[in-house]
Interface confidence: low
């Protein structure tokens, strides 16, 4: 009686169980009563990453420099190429099809977490006692200058965007 299910790494065709092709190889012809499944290795720019019955290998992903991408890991006959983003950019999506510039934190905000190849800059508002006067993808909020430690007094209060202005103490004669 012909089989209705096949073992692992086999597939059912014409009431017969044929061996799947191993990763890195594509199917050329199905097995018959008298012959084994015929498989061929994928070419240099192609891959298949599973036991399969595919008649075509998949093209390696192209890391398009115009999309800000570069090769992180070269593909093999069994694995796809892994792309990552150039410096200053991060992936637009999980599949990293293209990259976008890291966000800069505006004055009044500091960098809480510097961007990576896959995540954008995380900004945070500068709390009281701290400021940022630049738009930057790297700079954290900086503490206001301590006038007292310089034997000076505060002449102008600081804000989240500006440092305090220190000046000499008025000396009574």
């Amino acid at each position: 009686e012909p089989p209705t299910a096949c073992r692992e790494k086999q597939y059912l065709i014409n009431s017969q169980c044929c061996s799947l092709c191993q990763p890195g190889q594509k199917l050329v012809s199905d097995c018959t009563e008298f012959t084994e499944t015929e498989c061929l290795p994928c070419s240099e720019s192609e891959f298949l990453d599973t036991w399969n019955r595919e008649t075509r290998c998949h093209q390696h992903k192209y890391c398009d420099p115009n999309l800000g991408l570069r090769v992180q890991q070269k593909g093999t006959s069994e694995t796809d190429t892994i792309c990552t983003c150039e410096e200053g950019l991060h992936c637009m999506s999980e599949s990293c099809e293209s990259c976008v510039p890291h966000r800069s934190c505006l004055p009044g905000f500091g960098v809480k977490q510097i961007a990576t190849g896959v995540s954008d800059t995380i900004c945070e508002p500068c709390p009281v006692g701290f400021f940022s006067n630049v738009s930057s993808a790297f700079e954290k909020c900086r503490p206001w200058t301590s006038c007292e430690t310089k034997d000076l007094v505060v002449q102008q209060a600081g804000t989240n965007k500006t440092d305090v202005v220190c000046g000499p103490q008025d000396r009574q004669r």
């Epitope: 115009n66 637009m92 099809e97 293209s98 976008v100 966000r103 954008d120």
Partner: antibody, heavy 120, light 107 residues
Framework: QVQLVQSGAEVKKPGASVKVSCKAS????????VNWVRQAPGQRLEWMGL????????TYNQKFKGRVTLTIDKSASTAYMELSSLRSEDTAVYYC?????????????WGQGTLVTVSS | EIVMTQSPATLSVSPGERATLSCKAS??????VAWYQQKPGQAPRLLIY???DRRTGIPARFSGSGSGTEFTLTISSLQSEDFAVYYC?????????FGQGTKVEIK
């Protein structure tokens, strides 16, 4: 299929600024980038820059040296192009054109164009 | 910037004939070239992207070829609606740049 509707024609004096809008039929331009291209009378098309609505990331044509600003209002599914310090050579039809992330420069959907005339 | 040069500037062709438009890049742009059709008073329309991929819905009479610095748009049998200006665009490097256009007119 994305439809892009642009704001109406504008007449501006030299030195002024103009802001052109581009409203999409797709919610917040999800999955798309927005390019801006202009065409002066009888001239070739000229790419001005692109914006990624997803996070506001922009890339500009340096020819415009800080005169162009691209922004997005995701909640209104509208992209904006502002051009400042206008001169007579900026008289042109300005187009927005959207592209899928998978091919961000294909510019497969275009607005109808907005004529900006700069004249004293 | 990369300069895209199209030739000829004007091409006079009879309906039913074949039209071959050329676009040359000043440096290697690999296959990062798109072709657009523009009719008077209308926005450009994407025909071909990545040098040879036809956009969905574009008739099979339009085909693109080439890589590196030399690209060709071929219209195998011109229909009356094909008379227009055609632009090539490179998107290998910023700024993206268009050719100056080829006007295809009725002979």
């Amino acid at each position: 299929q994305v439809q892009l509707v642009q704001s109406g024609a504008e007449v501006k004096k030299p030195g002024a600024s103009v802001k052109v809008s581009c409203k999409a039929s797709v919610y917040s331009f999800t999955g798309y980038t927005v390019n801006w291209v202009r065409q002066a009378p009888g001239q070739r098309l000229e790419w001005m820059g692109l914006i990624v609505p997803y996070n506001g990331g922009t890339t500009y044509n340096q020819k415009f040296k800080g005169r162009v600003t691209l922004t997005i209002d995701k909640s209104a599914s509208t992209a904006y192009m502002e051009l400042s310090s206008l001169r007579s050579e900026d008289t042109a039809v300005y187009y927005c054109a959207s592209s899928r992330y998978s091919n961000p420069y294909a510019m497969d959907y275009w607005g109808q164009g907005t004529l900006v005339t700069v004249s004293s | 910037e990369i300069v895209m040069t199209q030739s000829p500037a004007t091409l006079s062709v009879s309906p039913g004939e074949r039209a071959t438009l050329s676009c040359k890049a000043s440096q290697n742009v690999h296959t990062r070239v798109a072709w657009y059709q523009q009719k008077p008073g209308q926005a450009p329309r994407l025909l071909i992207y990545l040098a040879s991929d036809r956009r969905t819905g574009i008739p099979a009479r339009f085909s693109g070829s080439g890589s590196g610095t030399e690209f060709t748009l071929t219209i195998s049998s011109l229909q009356s609606e094909d008379f227009a200006v055609y632009y090539c665009l490179q998107h290998w490097n910023y700024p993206l740049t268009f050719g100056q256009g080829t006007k295809v007119e009725i002979k």
